[in-house]
């Protein structure tokens, strides 16, 4: 190389990553094999689970607002699951990205698209649930499948918009040991007059924005929606059972558990620009927490359906029945009563979820919880006598 040849500019943290060399340590090789196996299994599970959810909810079920939310969540998770095999291949060939720069950009973008879409959709689901309880009349008049699809399209557009910087700044970087990284290179486009300043500001901007938009804000919306619903029900003199409250907390915990560690390490990575001492911690931890975030897409279908104790029996009967029992819409549980009665019954059902879900085959655990989040009481479309009685009773 000539003395004046300018090398590809890299941020210090990225250049240091490119200097890390692979070990031929046997125990590390075993860990790698286990990781490949685990990610391969997760890929398969994620694709099958989300594919089944999409097929059943999209083609075999009556379309409601709730099924619309689930359809879009499953689509997001299917996209993420579809990108997992390529990540598995990256691991299998010794942590080297052999699929080119364009595919590196696309693959990474799918991860971030799923991150934003999941956060946004969960927020929408929570707000939808909140509106049903806090503004029942408005909800009854405006909650349509078409409106839900429009909201989802807007949310997808926002998710795509937020993903653009991650597409733009993703790059393939050759490591000194011959491997190829698929990682952020924030100096890729218009590095500015001072690379240090650009590296610092862009890394912090990316980390903080994704933490806020894809994690903190959705979590705040979910929490405040739940609080608003709880308060409204308390004012009406309804007593909510502790078990149900714990279930609601479980869905929030599932989201926080899968994405929380990723955002923590992402923020640490941004901080590591100015504090090199943090870099080894980030290098060791980030692959694990990224995988955990990926596995959220595999876990989500389980949260919708597969945690019923008598799941196998229900699966044998009909997957459609199972899904409908979990995803049936509050507003469509009402009997032949007037719209006034249905609006009232929606609130009544929200107030007493256990009474509504007192059938012997009621879903438990996260399925019940997601039912609440999605505005359902896990009651099947063929409502029992108690449900019919409640739905035709005005307050």
């Amino acid at each position: 190389m000539s003395a004046n040849a300018t090398l590809k500019p890299l941020c210090p943290i990225l250049e240091q990553m490119s200097r890390l060399q692979s070990h031929s340590n046997t125990s590390i090789r075993y860990i790698d094999h286990a990781a490949v196996l685990l990610h391969g299994l997760a890929s398969l599970l994620g694709l099958v689970e989300n594919g089944v959810i999409l097929f059943v909810v999209g083609c075999r079920m009556r379309q409601t607002v709730v099924t619309t939310w689930v359809l879009h969540l499953a689509l997001s998770d299917l996209l993420a699951s579809a990108s997992l095999p390529f990540f598995t291949y990256f691991l299998a060939v010794g942590h080297s990205w052999e699929l080119g720069t364009t595919f590196c950009k696309l693959h990474s973008s799918i991860f971030f698209l799923n991150m934003f879409a999941s956060g946004f959709l969960l927020s929408a689901i929570s707000l939808d649930r909140c509106l049903q309880v806090v503004r029942p009349v408005w909800a009854q008049n405006h909650r349509t499948v078409a409106a839900a699809h429009k909201v989802c399209l807007v949310l997808w557009a926002l998710a795509v918009l937020n993903t653009v910087p991650y597409f733009v700044f993703r790059d393939t970087i050759s490591r000194l040991d011959g491997r190829i990284m698929c990682y952020y290179n924030v100096l890729l486009l218009n590095p500015g007059p001072d690379r240090d300043a650009t590296c610092n500001s862009r890394q912090v901007a990316l980390a903080v924005s994704k933490f806020l938009l894809a994690f903190l804000v959705p979590l705040a919306i979910i929490a405040s929606s739940h609080a608003a619903v709880s308060l409204r029900l308390q004012h009406r003199g309804r007593r909510r059972p502790g078990r149900f409250v714990r279930l609601v907390a479980a869905v929030v915990a599932a989201f926080a558990l899968c994405w929380g560690p990723y955002h923590v390490f992402s923020l640490l990575e941004a901080r590591a620009h100015a504090n090199p001492g943090l870099r080894p911690l980030v290098w060791r931890g980030l692959p694990f927490v990224t995988s955990l975030a990926f596995f959220n897409s595999v876990a989500n279908p389980v949260l919708y359906v597969l945690t019923c104790p008598d799941m196998l029996r229900k699966l044998r009967r009909s997957l459609r029945t199972v899904l409908e029992s979990v995803l049936v819409d509050d507003s469509e549980l009402g009997g032949a009563g007037s719209s006034r009665r249905r609006r009232t019954s929606s609130t009544a059902r929200s107030a007493s979820p256990l009474a509504l879900c007192s059938r012997p085959e009621e879903p438990r655990g996260p399925a019940r919880l997601l039912g609440w989040l999605l505005g359902s009481c896990a009651a099947s479309p063929q409502t029992g006598p108690l449900n019919r009685a409640l739905s035709s009773t005005s307050s």
């Epitope: 004046n4 300018t6 090398l7 250049e15 240091q16 200097r19 001072d194 240090d196 300043a197 090199p276």
Partner: antibody, heavy 118, light 107 residues
Amino acid sequence: EVQLVESGGGLVQPGGSLRLSCAASGFTFSFYSMSWVRQAPGKGLEWVARISNGGSTTDYPGTVEGRFTISRDNSKNTLYLQMNSLRAEDTAVYYCARHRTNWDFDYWGQGTLVTVSS
Amino acid sequence: DIQMTQSPSSLSASVGDRVTITCRASENIYWNLAWYQQKPGKAPKLVVYAATQLADGVPSRFSGSGSGTDYTLTISSLQPEDFATYYCQHFWITPWTFGQGTKVEIK
């Protein structure tokens, strides 16, 4: 051809000040981070200061922090080292060096001698 | 601060000899190490960067290796122009410190 030429060295009394310059040529100066490294007579090398390519970030070891200031003028392709409150132990040959990327000094000047003595 | 300890401080060798200089850091420096060659009255010259990478124009008889805290500069067959003082320097966390140097002399 890459060239780094230091100037401004000389004899100075303890507590005095001195400003070193390093004229760069043969490469795009504004693309590279730069450093100053010194070598006391008969001793080893000691890194003294570093500045990012645009001048927004500077780093110093504890031995000179607060006394030395590194700066650059990209329009003049020149690197500077302002040395205040000089001590006898600051006596050394001062080299300016170009960073290959973020680190690794790939080109060095021939050095300028700074003598701090009363 | 990270301390860099070079050994030996000096060595005598003949042309054609294989020479090994070691550098130990007081903590893991993750391959962020450079080796320089300095001849009397001259400026240092970069020989190896990132612990293992040969700088432009450096003969292939020079090689760098190591990881963690221990690094090595090897000259496979010493040539007359290789007699000089060699310094290691880490670039992990500032301050970037140098080793005290290893003087390679003619036997």
